[in-house]
Interface confidence: low
């Protein structure tokens, strides 16, 4: 499989909500034997890889905001912690995986980076990951409602896989 | 603050079996795979497998494959390591670790080592 | 299995010298390379995860590089501390392997 990153820029004003988006392409198995994690991240744009270091959203790291299920089922976040800083994070039966940003601030600006690992017991874990760019912008040139910008088919396939 | 505390040192015969204990506590048991590794003395590092609680099923490296098990109580947020068939060069310091994510192997927690002495 | 290759197995220093320690993969592990330090009597200590990104926790003077196969530890000023056993270890496949290791001794 592979993930897919719908839009690979956001620009939104300051105090807005908005919802990233990561997308599984191709088949998902979906066996008794097969978990998925997701995850969600901030990253830098490394010289080497995309996404490769991990820093926390809003404080929250990957482990406080991943999701795991099986291949059946949906999942959420929903838990205290990750809604107590304003962040949302959910998986749908669609292969849709997002995580909801509220109230935004300019230091929500930055990379971010959606992770999903597929577990295959007794065998080997694929790793994938796509990356977006969050852009919070304040003062006249602000939009007044977020404005998204769809990935290159290139773009959209921005995966690295293990 | 995350903290895996072993059992203590143990001394087996040749042919015996040991189990070492990795008790969590500081954090999230379930959604961590907690591996074992072990180094012989004046060696180096050897993972012997792995677990995550919250599947229930443990992952072998091949040399360990049918002399190892590795279980873990979510109950007590304790993970364990049996090896059979003992023999002499499993003579070693046996440690836990868990990954610093659910599904990765790179480990930012570590117990204090166990060490286990196979002699006759 | 991948095999990880440490060198040089050990290497002598002074405070403040500018150590570098490679390790090389059978096959190529994207980034998926952490380092360790190791001192006698004690568990390993993570360094350096994902090839380059540093540890929390961790002094800046230790940093990491490379991908596919050819991986690079240095420390830009050895410090008193930093005497110890060094490995190398991938994760991007099961089993996970370590390097052979890399002691680093005062001069």
């Known amino acids: 499989f592979k993930v897919a990153t719908p839009y690979s820029l956001y620009v939104c004003p300051e105090g807005q909500n908005v919802t990233l988006t990561c997308r599984l392409l191709g088949p998902v198995d979906k066996g008794h034997d097969v978990t998925f994690y997701k995850t969600w991240y901030r990253s830098s744009r490394g010289e080497v890889q995309t996404c490769s270091e991990r820093r926390p959203i809003r404080n929250l790291t990957f482990q406080d905001l991943h999701l795991h299920h099986g291949g059946h089922q949906a999942a959420n976040t929903s838990h205290d912690l990750a809604q107590r800083h304003g962040l949302e994070s959910a998986s749908d039966h669609h292969g849709n995986f997002s995580i909801t940003m509220r109230n935004l601030t300019l230091l929500d600006s930055g990379l971010y980076c959606c992770l999903v690992v597929e577990i295959r017991h007794h065998h080997s874990e694929h790793r994938v990951h796509g990356a977006m760019e969050l852009q919070v912008q304040t003062g006249k040139d602000a939009p007044s409602n977020c404005v998204v910008y769809p990935s290159s088919s290139q773009d959209s396939e921005n995966i690295t896989a293990a | 603050q995350v903290q895996l505390v072993q059992s203590g040192a143990e001394v087996k015969k040749p042919g015996s079996s040991v189990k070492v204990s990795c008790k969590a506590s500081?954090?999230?048991?379930?959604?961590?795979?907690i591996s074992w590794v072990r180094q012989a003395p004046g060696q180096g590092l050897e993972w012997m497998g792995g677990?995550?609680?919250?599947?229930?099923?443990?992952n072998y490296a091949q040399k360990f494959q049918g002399r190892v098990t590795i279980t873990a109580d979510e109950s007590t947020s304790t993970a364990y390591m049996e090896l059979s068939s003992l023999r002499s060069e499993d003579t070693a310091v046996y440690y836990c670790?868990?990954?610093?994510?659910?599904?990765?192997?790179?480990?930012?927690?570590w117990g204090q080592g166990t060490l286990v002495t196979v002699s006759s | 299995d991948i095999q990880m290759t440490q060198s040089p197995s050990s290497l002598s220093a002074s405070v403040g010298d500018r150590v570098t320690i490679t390790c090389r993969a059978s096959?190529?592990?994207?980034?998926?390379l952490n380092w360790y330090q190791q001192k006698p009597g004690k568990a390993p200590k993570l360094l350096i995860y994902a090839a380059s990104s540093l540890q929390s926790g961790v002094p800046s003077r230790f940093s990491g590089s490379g991908s596919g196969t050819d991986f690079t530890l240095t420390i830009s000023s050895l410090q008193p501390e930093d005497f110890a056993t060094y490995y190398c270890?991938?994760?991007?496949?099961?089993?996970?392997?370590f390097g052979q290791g890399t002691k680093v001794e005062i001069k």
């Open positions: 670790a868990r990954s610093s994510y659910g599904w990765s192997y790179e480990f930012d927690y």
């Open positions: 096959q190529s592990i994207a980034t998926y």
């Open positions: 500081g954090g999230t048991f379930s959604s961590y795979a």
């Open positions: 677990i995550i609680p919250i599947f229930g099923t443990a």
């Open positions: 270890q991938q994760n991007h496949n099961r089993p996970i392997t």
